[in-house]
Interface confidence: low
């Protein structure tokens, strides 16, 4: 389980055309459910139940986004429509170039994602928890345009990170 280095860039613009960018860094883990690859794309927040919808006409995004899914406590969803791995697959099928799971409230998901799979996804499936997950969700919940870069090694040059 290798470390995934995640850089998130938040882009804010004003009506006057000015803009400011904020960058923050966090770390997660590449799970065995996916590939240990670098990936990059605009963040799309997905509700776990939103991935249950099997209608291919709905919720399709252009290829290349990074799906962020905050998993809920297992008690809140005792009979999930899909396993965590199934949700990752569904996101990739819909065009995600990577999936990041916040497993803070469902640590059991880590084992599910790391169970040996005969057919792992060809895109990275990363999980975050604790302070890193809080950082990520704080950004995602701002509902502003944000972009994630996932790398399997630290950035070649140190990036200035700013907590959101």
């Amino acid at each position: 389980k290798e470390t995934a280095f995640v850089e998130v860039v938040l882009f804010e613009s004003s009506p006057s055309g000015d803009y400011t960018t904020y960058t923050t860094g966090l770390t997660g883990r590449f799970s065995r459910a996916g590939a240990t690859l670098s990936a990059e794309g605009e963040i799309v927040q997905m509700h776990p139940l939103g991935l249950c919808n099997n209608n291919d006409e709905e919720d399709l995004y252009e290829y290349g986004w990074v799906g962020v899914v905050k998993l809920e406590q297992p008690e809140l969803d005792p009979k999930p429509c899909l396993t965590v791995l199934g949700k990752a697959k569904r996101a990739v099928q819909r065009g995600a170039t990577a999936v990041i799971f916040d497993v803070s409230e469902n640590p059991e998901a880590i084992d599910q994602l790391n169970q040996g799979s005969e057919d792992p996804l060809k895109r990275p499936v990363v999980y975050v928890k604790g302070a890193d997950a809080i950082k990520l969700m704080n950004i995602v919940n701002k509902q502003k345009v944000a972009r994630a870069r996932i790398q399997h090694r630290p950035p070649r040059q140190p990036t200035e990170y700013f907590d959101m």
Partner: antibody
């Protein structure tokens, strides 16, 4: 009107130094990530480097071809971007453009008119 | 770093559709931007983030990007569109901005 105006170009001998300036107006310069891009005569565009804004810690990054020789700096109080070029080589001969970088620091939406730097003995 | 390859030249008749390609390894995983440069002038951004058009750019300019190829399409090409066109991306693996070699569009 959003505008960038470069100055400081000219003729310099190999091994010499030159400092280019880029005066910005019409937008909040201190928020912007700024870049230098060059174009050798009759050739294509080549990214030189950029500087982040204050929020980004004024971090700079450079193309491999100029790293260690060129330095980008900025003076937000003067709305001015600089490019200090040392140990110049004949292959550095080009029109140098300053540009504002947006959309996750990838695309350049505002360009200056460029200033010609000629490195020749 | 990723390398972007463009055809050196493309010719088109007025009113026809011009397509300029830009190829690179897994380019569809990156955002691609396109610039128009006329002789003696600075480049102008005509398409950003694969297919977005900045304000002031005519609707006849459009872009797409998938697989290993990004394409700039100019429908109903006009004489004033004759220029050099450059694709560009941000190589986030190496923190560098990369330009293609440029394509000279000739309107016959």
């Amino acid at each position: 009107e959003v505008q960038l105006v470069e100055s400081g170009g000219g003729l310099v001998k190999p091994g010499g130094s030159l400092r280019l300036s880029c005066a910005a107006s019409g937008f909040t310069f201190s928020n912007a990530w700024m870049s230098w891009v060059r174009q050798a005569p009759g050739k294509g565009l080549e990214w030189v480097g950029f500087t982040k804004n204050e929020v980004g810690g004024y971090t700079t990054e450079y193309a491999a071809s100029v790293k260690g020789r060129f330095t980008i700096s900025r003076d937000d109080s003067k709305n001015t971007l600089y490019l200090q070029m040392n140990s110049l080589k004949t292959e550095d001969t080009a029109v140098y453009y300053c540009a504002r970088a947006i959309y996750y620091l990838e695309a350049f939406d505002v360009w200056g008119q460029g200033t010609l730097v000629t490195v020749s003995s | 770093d990723i390398e972007l390859t463009q055809p050196p030249s493309v010719s088109v008749s007025p009113g026809q559709t011009a397509s300029i390609t830009c190829s690179g390894d897994s380019l569809g995983s990156y955002y691609v931007h396109w610039y128009q440069q006329k002789p003696g002038q600075a480049p102008v951004l005509v398409i950003y983030r694969n297919k977005q058009r900045p304000s002031g750019i005519p609707e006849r300019f459009s872009g797409s990007n998938s697989g290993n190829t990004a394409t700039l399409t100019i429908s109903g090409t006009q004489a004033e569109d004759e220029a050099d066109y450059y694709c560009q991306t941000y190589d986030w693996m190496y923190s560098s901005r990369v330009f293609g070699g440029g394509t000279k569009l000739t309107v016959l």
